[in-house]
Structures are given as C-alpha cells and as structure tokens.
C-alpha cells in the first residue's frame, strides 16, 4: 500500500480469481483512543472498532473510503483504490491502446518545435468518475524539471456504438534549449482514476523524435504566363523553431486530382517555391518536415487550382 | 525518399555538400545496423545514449545560432580554446567563434572517426561476419575534416589485445551510430546556418 | 473454490461451426480476463484467444482470425467459443483459463474435425 | 505457432536434478514474466511456477523456476517417478495485449 495523496491511498493487488489479498492497516488520524468505530462509503454498519482497523483488501468491494467516527462526528477518511496486476502485468483498462505507431501506445505526444514545449493525448470509453494526475521530467534518475498543466477533455467522437473522450495535456521543460542534443528521454507519467480503480501509464520519448510542425502557412499561387505551370510560394509556420537557417525544413508538394485515385504528383524541396503544372479541378497541397532528422510530416496545406 | 528532390546550390560554403553527405551516410549507416542486428537492443528506445565527445568538446555551445545566444538554457556551456584556421573560412570574415565551432566539428569528426575505425577492426575478426561499417561513412568522414582542414595531432587508433567481445562491439557500435547520427543533424544545421549568415 | 466447466465439444464436418461454453463459478466471473487454449493431440499448448473482463476487447491467435469469436456472458458466469469454417487442423482438446499469476483451468473439451 | 523453445525431452534416474531451459526473445521472456506448467496424459495443465521463480502453494519446493535475459529455465531437484510428465513454459508478448506464447514442450522421463 501507498499514498497517493493525502487521505488516498493504492492498495497493489495479484489479481485472479481467488486471490488471498493484501491486509491492510487503517489508523484514524486523531488523539482520541477510544469510542472509535470504522465504516465504508455511505453505509452505517459498523466494520469495527478502535484506533485501527485491520481489512483483507481482495476485490472492489473491498475498496473505498473508510471513515472513523466517534460519537457521531467524523474524525477522518482513509480513500482506498485498487492497482490490479494481472499475471505480472499491471492492468490497462482505463484508457484505450492507440496502436500508433506500435501497439501498447496509450499516451501519445507531439511537439510543435524544439523550444520544450510538447502536448500528449489519450483516449478512453469512460465518461464519468474519472480523474487524470500528469507529472513529467527529463531523465528518470535524476530528473529535470518539466511542467504540466490540467489534463482536459479535448474531443469526443462516436466510434461505431461507443463514445469515445480525448484528453490531454499540454507541458513545458523548464529550462530548454532548442539546439541542445537529447541525451536524456522525457518521461511522462499519467495517473488514471476511475471510481476504484487506480492505473498508471507511462510514455518515455525525446523532442526530436515527436517534432511534428505546423502546416506551411500563407500558401499561394502565381501562374505563370503562357503556361499551364504555377509557381507556389509558402512560408514557415509561426510556431516553428528559430532561427529557420538553423532549424530549417524540406517541403512536400503535391498534386492531387478530384478523384483520389488519380496519380498524385510529388516534388519535394528544401525552398519555399516551387514550380508545378495545375490540372483543372486539382488542389495544391504542401506540407513540411524537419529537414536534417525525418520525425513526422506536417498536416497538408492546401489550396485549389482554380 | 525516391523522389524528386530539388537540391539548393550549395552555395559558397564548401562544407555544406560534405556535411548534407554525412548526415545522409550515417543516417543509411544506421538503418542498416538496426535491420541487420534486429535480435540486439539497436533502436533508440533500447539504448543507452553516450556522447563520446562529452567534456571533450562543446560543438553545440560554439556553434549555437546567435539568436539562441540569448537562451539562458543555452549558455550552460563549458569554455574550450580549439585551434583556429581552416579552410572552410576562406574568402571569409571570421570571428572566433565561428573558427571556434568549426574546430570543435573537426575535433568531433576525428573522434568518431578512430572510434569507428577501432570498432571495425574488431567486426573483422566476427566469425559470423554480421556487419562492417560502410566504407562509404568513413570516406565520407575524411571529406569533410578535409574541408575543415584543420592541423591537429593525430590520435592513434585504439588498439586491444584481449579478444573482443562481439555482441558488446555490436551493441557499442548501435550506441555510437545513434549520437553521431545526433551530432551529424547539429553539423548539418550548423553548415546551413553559415551559409545562409 | 473456483471452477470452470466446459461443454459443447464434438465431431464435426470441414466447414461447419460449433460453439464451446465454459460455465465459471466460486468466483466474480465479471472481474477477470479469459482464455482459451488448445492442445492437439500429441502436441504442445496453442493460445488460441483472450477476452478482457468485460470484454471490451478480444485478441486471437492469427492462425484463428476471422473464423474464431470469444464473447461472454457476465450475468450467466459463462465465457464462450465460437467457431466456423473450422478445418482439420483446428482438432484439438479446448480448455479455457482464467487470466492471472495463478490460473485455473477447465477440465478440457475435445473438438475433431474430420469429413 | 511456438515461440518459445524447449528441448523436446530430458530424463533422469530418481534423486537426479533435471533441468528445462525455455528460449524466447526480446518482446516475450525478455520483457514479460514466465510460467512453468505439469501435465500429466490426459489432464489440463497444472500451474507449477509464476512470476519466473515464484511456487503457488501445495507444489513441491523441489520445483524451481528462473529466468535470466531472454531465457528461462525450470529445476526439478531430486527428480520423483511422479514427476514423469510433459513440461511447457509460457510468457506474454510485449507488442500483442493478453497474447500467451507457450514453449514447444519438453518430455520428462524418470529412469530405472
């Protein structure tokens, strides 16, 4: 058993069918000695008596908050939450594994540019009862500071006849700079709560490997005369790391007819232009990557030919 | 990417091409070590990331962009004094920082290189014969410290006597391609940051 | 004490279905992760497919996807297998197993399939 | 469909030590825990160690378990004519959720 918080503590349990359980220890937090009886959650019936209270803690019903009272007046709470491990391995019911980019991935993150700051979202069935704790730092053995705001809900969407709840959280190295080289991962700790049931997901990762840029901005056409040719002009995104001489990106564009299984054109570039023929009813999209380490290509940019 | 490139000029600079070359040779060098040794801890969440050039030189804090010089993050660095002429800096004004940076890359360069020369020696005495450095990466290596063209001493290659221990030399040599591929990703952008100056 | 009964084996023809059943009690049935495993006759022990406790999600062996499903029923304490297209190398005994450091297994059911 | 890998048979005269090695790879022993189970012909399998060295109660404590990198190995210290029956590891795959992967199975004869 350990605490949590203050008043919340995680019973760890072997669970299968059967299992014997942990006995777990309840004080009550209070000078008085006697007239000390328990209870569990909203019910009145009496588990025991005295300043302890001695449980075999095996299923949920096990669990939750237990009170010592004395004389009709509360004296403290004691939350119990249940960590299951399931034949070694600790239980991941609470959130959904996302399958990307390998399977087990429950947390996911990005960052924008170098500059420390990345977001990280999970996903879950669950709608209610349900509390997220994050914390993060770079290096585990040592750690570094890193700061984390409130996880919030971000998107719901219907995924056949199940709900589906994003969540995330946005976070900050305290002190970083955007052209250090990553020695240490950055580790990111969620805690997940639903009712009883308390699990905790890890997600280990360096900046340079979540980097994901913003779409090209200001993305425009100028046709050239006496031509079917376009040149296309775009920009940096706004959030990307400076100086863009240091950091600077490749560029993707393409070509792509109304009907998705026409043939795609794709040039690719280290400039901000770039020369391409425009078919009728045919959109121009470009989108961007890190030009010297090939983490994630940007969203597209798009605009129509016409 | 088997695909149309539009490749810029590579301008004045002349370490530019070798560098863009290095990163390219590493990278290859890397995808190769990771498939081939696919049954060793060989991709980046397996190992552990040394810097062999760690106290040794301080290419991140010399060529750090002067718009980061201002990043307080950034400035933690260690002072080193480095020798100072090379002819990636003709026909050029240089300060010494930049003469400072430059040689901190030359002295990184020549570091990796013994490292992987010693380390080869080795992989050529595996019986199995898994897996050799590309000649090319080491070629490529040579160019650019040509280009640099810094004097320095020569550091003499690492020789062992006892018998090397192959899945560690092939374990050392994953850990060893991951940081220069790091610290090819800093030179290149270093490179494209004094060309464009 | 926990106990898990099976049911539902027998001989049946290439191509055609047959549903396992395993009627679980001694236990809460609706906390706990299920298995099936097979074993050939002579052979070793195959997992064939889990289902998490309130079976939100199903994994199967890819020598069994897409014919096999494995469903429960939390109310009824009885975890399922069911099986079509079913080929001659799908004869085996069928157990199926709680999930868990110290798992419990029924008695085993044999299912042939042979023309 | 076996990942993991066990000799197909190793015997012993009664009061030898016998042992079973079981070889798996990074994503299964080398990141998940191993079991060891008995059976006997013509019963289901029973549960001789979890946990790579843990005994559930009422096996023998001449039955051990270990397991070192990628490898697991089960001992039967002063081998038993009883003890004659086939043996088979098991542990989990990292990268597939609830997914079991069983050794090959390994024969264990008690001689004379």
């Known amino acids: 058993i350990w605490e949590l918080k203050k008043d919340v503590y995680v019973v760890e349990l072997d669970w299968y069918p059967d299992a014997p359980g942990e006995m777990v220890v309840l004080t009550c937090d209070t000078p008085e000695e006697d007239g000390i009886t328990w209870t569990l959650d909203q019910s009145s019936e009496v588990l025991g008596s005295g300043k302890t209270l001695t449980i075999q803690v095996k299923e949920f019903g096990d669990a939750g908050q237990y009170t010592c009272h004395k004389g009709g007046e509360v004296l403290s709470h004691s939350l119990l939450l249940l960590h299951k491990k399931e034949d070694g391995i600790w239980s991941t019911d609470i959130l959904k594994d996302q399958k990307e980019p390998k399977n087990k991935t429950f947390l996911r993150c990005e960052a924008k540019n170098y500059s420390g700051r990345f977001t990280c979202w999970w996903l879950t069935t669950i709608s209610t009862d349900l509390t997220f704790s994050v914390k993060s730092s770079r290096g585990s053995s040592d750690p570094q500071g890193v700061t984390c705001g409130a996880a919030t809900l971000s998107a719901e969407r219907v995924r056949g006849d199940n709900k589906e709840y994003e969540y995330s959280v946005e976070c900050q190295e305290d002190s970083a700079c955007p052209a250090a080289e990553e020695s240490l991962p950055i580790e990111v700790m969620v805690d997940a709560v639903h009712k009883l049931k308390y699990e905790n997901y890890t997600s280990s990762f360096f900046i340079r490997d979540i980097i994901k840029p913003d779409p090209p901005k200001n993305l425009q056409l100028k046709p050239l005369k006496n031509s079917r040719q376009v040149e296309v002009s775009w920009e940096y995104p706004d959030t990307w790391s400076t100086p863009h001489s240091y950091f600077s990106l490749t560029f993707c564009v393409q070509v792509q007819g109304k009907s998705k299984r026409e043939k795609k054109d794709r040039v690719f570039t280290d400039k901000t232009s770039a020369t391409v023929i425009c078919r009728k009813n045919a959109s121009i999209s470009v989108r961007a990557q890190d030009r010297y380490y090939s983490s994630s290509w940007s969203e597209w940019a798009s605009v129509p030919c016409s | 990417r088997n695909l149309p490139v539009a490749t810029p000029d590579p301008g004045m600079f002349p370490c530019l091409h070798h560098s863009q070359n290095l990163l390219r040779a590493v990278s290859n060098m890397l995808q190769k070590a990771r498939q081939t040794l696919e049954f060793y801890p060989c991709t980046s969440e397996e190992i552990d990331h040394e810097d062999i050039t760690k106290d040794k030189t301080s290419t991140v804090e010399a060529c750090l962009p002067l718009e980061l010089t201002k990043n307080e993050s950034c400035l933690n660095s260690r002072e080193t004094s480095f020798i100072t002429n090379g002819s990636c800096l003709a026909s050029r004004k240089t300060s010494f920082m930049m003469a400072l940076c430059l040689s901190s890359i030359y002295e990184d360069l020549k570091m990796y290189q013994v490292e992987f020369k010693t380390m080869n020696a080795k992989l050529l005495m595996d019986p199995k014969r898994q897996i050799f450095l590309d000649q090319n990466m080491l070629a490529v290596i040579d160019e650019l410290m040509q280009a640099l063209n810094f004097n320095s001493e020569t550091v003499p290659q690492k020789s062992s006597l006892e018998e090397p221990d192959f899945y560690k030399t092939k374990i050392k040599l994953c850990i060893l391609l991951h940081a220069f591929r790091i610290r090819a990703v800093t030179i290149d952008r270093v490179m494209s940051y004094l060309n464009a100056s | 004490q926990v106990q898990l009964v099976q049911s539902g084996g027998g001989v049946v023809q290439p191509g055609r279905s047959l549903r396992l059943s395993c009627a679980a009690s001694?236990?809460?049935?609706?906390?706990?992760?299920m298995h099936w495993v097979r074993q050939a006759p002579g052979k070793g022990l195959e997992w064939v497919a889990f289902?998490?406790?309130?079976?939100?999600?199903?994994y199967y062996a890819d020598s069994v996807k897409g014919r096999f499903t494995i469903s429960r029923d939390n109310s009824k304490n009885t975890l399922y297998l069911q099986m079509k297209s079913l080929r001659a190398e799908d004869t085996a005994v069928y157990y199926c197993?709680?999930?868990?450091?110290?798992?419990?297994w029924g008695q085993g059911t044999m299912v042939t399939v042979s023309s | 469909s076996y990942v993991l890998t066990q000799p197909p048979s190793v015997s012993g005269t009664p009061g030898q030590r016998v042992t079973i090695s079981c070889s798996g790879g990074r994503s299964n022993i080398g990141s998940n825990t191993v079991k060891w189970y008995q059976q006997l012909p013509g019963t289901a399998p029973k549960l001789l160690i979890y946990?790579?060295?843990q005994r559930p109660s009422g096996v023998p404590d001449r039955f051990s378990g270990s397991k070192s990198g990628t490898s697991a190995s089960l001992a039967i210290t002063g081998v038993q004519a009883e003890d004659e029956a086939d043996y088979y590891c098991?542990?989990?795959?990292?990268?597939?959720?609830?997914?079991?992967?069983f050794g090959t199975g390994t024969k264990v004869t008690v001689l004379g």
């Open positions: 289902i998490r406790y309130d079976g939100s999600n199903k």
């Open positions: 098991q542990s989990y795959d990292s990268s597939l959720w609830g997914t079991r992967v």
């Open positions: 197993t709680t999930h868990g450091s110290h798992d419990t």
């Open positions: 001694g236990f809460t049935f609706s906390s706990y992760g």
């Open positions: 946990g790579n060295d």
